[in-house]
């Protein structure tokens, strides 16, 4: 029961996390114009991974896409790549984990296969979360660096009395969404990995061992408690007891009072 709950919760947490990573990747507010201790302008600038936007005081907003690949900073490209890898891995992980869920029965899929799929999806979620956290952190670091550089050169002289004010950018909402989403995906992945341990069949299936007595060839088959002479058609060790240790969850395959607690 606990395993099913852990697996289900891990799936839901990861699902929310990946939705958050997708949302963060698409959001325009990765960096927003810093309004603190800055000459107040009647326009508000903010930028995303794919386009930059300007909102005028009237509320009129204009966004322009980055229609160049080669002209963009390498760091921005790296962040894009990390976020996309995170989304792709997360999406595959979700797909795999759906089939790995204990509450979903697919044909005669063995528990060992479900355990492997749960582990695979868990690892994928962990990597996906790490990619998102890394991407957002790289962008945040880039912002911090640029912020202090532009603070140092806040007023760039252009000869004579003319000055141009550099627009400083600070953390946008997308960064926080990305960090939280990455963290959730990571937690979800860890939960899936924990659930995998509970799902995996314990290796306690005793192999049939033949003990040959001095006089008679008698095969003792532990578990089946059936003995036969070592001759004739019974010399093959037939699998009488499937030694795969079932978990408490598997034993309760039919509804019991515990299912409704």
């Amino acid at each position: 029961m606990a395993v099913t709950a852990c697996q289900g919760l891990g799936f839901v947490v990861s699902l929310i996390g990946i939705a958050g990573i997708i949302a963060a990747t698409c959001m325009d507010q990765w960096s927003t114009q810093d309004l603190y201790n800055n000459p107040v302008t009647a326009v508000f600038n903010y930028q995303g991974l794919w386009r930059s936007c300007v909102r005028e005081s009237s509320g009129f907003t204009e966004c322009r896409g980055y229609f160049t690949l080669l002209g963009l900073p390498a760091m921005l490209q790296a962040v894009r790549a990390l976020m996309i890898v995170g989304i792709v891995l997360g999406a595959i992980g979700l797909l795999v984990s759906i089939f790995a869920l204990k509450c979903i029965r697919i044909g005669s899929m063995e528990d060992s296969a479900k355990a492997n799929m749960t582990l695979t999806s868990g690892i994928m979620f962990i990597v996906s979360g790490l990619c998102a956290i890394a991407g957002v952190s790289v962008f945040a670091n880039m912002l911090v660096t640029n912020f202090w550089m532009s603070t140092a050169n806040m007023y760039t002289g252009m000869g004579g009395m003319v000055q141009t004010v550099q627009t400083r950018y600070t953390f946008g909402a997308a960064l926080f969404v990305g960090w939280v989403a990455g963290g959730l995906t990571l937690i979800g992945g860890v939960m899936m990995c924990i659930a995998c341990r509970g799902l995996a069949p314990e290796e306690t299936n005793y192999k049939a061992v033949s003990y040959h007595a001095s006089g008679h060839s008698v095969a003792y088959k532990p578990g089946g408690f059936k003995a036969s002479t070592g001759f004739g058609s019974n010399t093959k060790n037939k699998k009488i007891y499937d030694g795969g240790a079932r978990t408490e969850d598997e034993v309760q395959s039919y509804p019991s009072k515990h299912d409704y607690v």
């Epitope: 107040v40 930028q47 322009r64 000055q163 141009t164």
Partner: antibody, heavy 120, light 113 residues
Framework: QVQLVQSGAEVKKPGASVKVSCKAS????????IHWVRQAPGQGLEWMGR????????YYNEKFTGRVTMTRDTSTSTVYMELSSLRSEDTAVYYC?????????????WGQGTTVTVSS | DIVMTQSPDSLAVSLGERATINCKSS????????????LTWYQQKPGQPPKLLIY???TRESGVPDRFSGSGSGTDFTLTISSLQAEDVAVYYC?????????FGGGTKLEIK
């Protein structure tokens, strides 16, 4: 059509207050900023501040902070500008103007102006 | 506050001739985000409120004759009337529409020679 109709001329004594009204029509009143700009006789234009009728948010020119108050009445689509502690240099024509949408923060419609004379 | 300096203070031009008014701001009015200059031009005729002519330094307001054009970027801007008409006699103001508080130039009085 968009119209901004202002109240009539006022004559005030120094130290008094004046309240000028600006009634809007022909558009959704709560969706556009209203600015107040004044013009002293034979002088240029001076921006005093603005109010967003939808929320009542205001932004004042620091020169007038503490002396100017902008309010609105959404039921009558009217914006008010009150200037206190009047001085002779406050003698001017006071204009209300609507900020256009997607027009680079420019004022696309103006009231006819209200003449305020401060004299002892 | 941003200082807007207009030149000349007054200008006399013959009918049909080109009139050019300059405006200089103490800080750049160019927004890097959209590469637009937040400078506005107004026309004010005697006894009337100002009228919006040009915004974003070069975009004509609807209904404004195409003989009016704006140019410039950063700190230096120009309003050009390609062929002066009698009804163009007015005072022209440039305005910083980028920084608070909004500030206006001193105005240029345009007359017919």
């Amino acid at each position: 059509q968009v119209q901004l109709v202002q109240s009539g001329a006022e004559v005030k004594k120094p130290g008094a207050s004046v309240k000028v009204s600006c009634k809007a029509s022909g558009y959704i009143f709560t969706n556009y900023w209203i600015h107040w700009v004044r013009q002293a006789p034979g002088q240029g234009l001076e921006w005093m501040g603005r109010i967003y009728p939808g929320t009542g948010n205001t932004y004042y020119n620091e020169k007038f902070t503490g002396r100017v108050t902008m309010t609105r009445d959404t039921s009558t689509s009217t914006v008010y500008m009150e200037l206190s502690s009047l001085r002779s240099e406050d003698t001017a024509v006071y204009y209300c103007a609507r900020e256009g949408y997607g027009k680079g923060n420019s004022m696309d419609y103006w009231g006819q102006g209200t003449t305020v004379t401060v004299s002892s | 506050d941003i200082v807007m300096t207009q030149s000349p203070d007054s200008l006399a031009v013959s009918l049909g001739e080109r009139a050019t008014i300059n405006c200089k701001s103490s800080q750049s009015l160019l927004n890097a985000g959209n590469q637009k200059n937040y400078l506005t031009w107004y026309q004010q005729k005697p006894g009337q409120p100002p009228k919006l002519l040009i915004y974003w330094a070069s975009t004509r307001e609807s209904g404004v004759p195409d003989r009016f054009s704006g140019s410039g970027s950063g700190t230096d801007f120009t309003l050009t009337i390609s062929s002066l008409q009698a009804e163009d006699v007015a005072v022209y103001y440039c305005q910083n529409a980028y920084y608070y508080p909004y500030t206006f130039g001193g105005g240029t009085k345009l007359e017919i020679k």
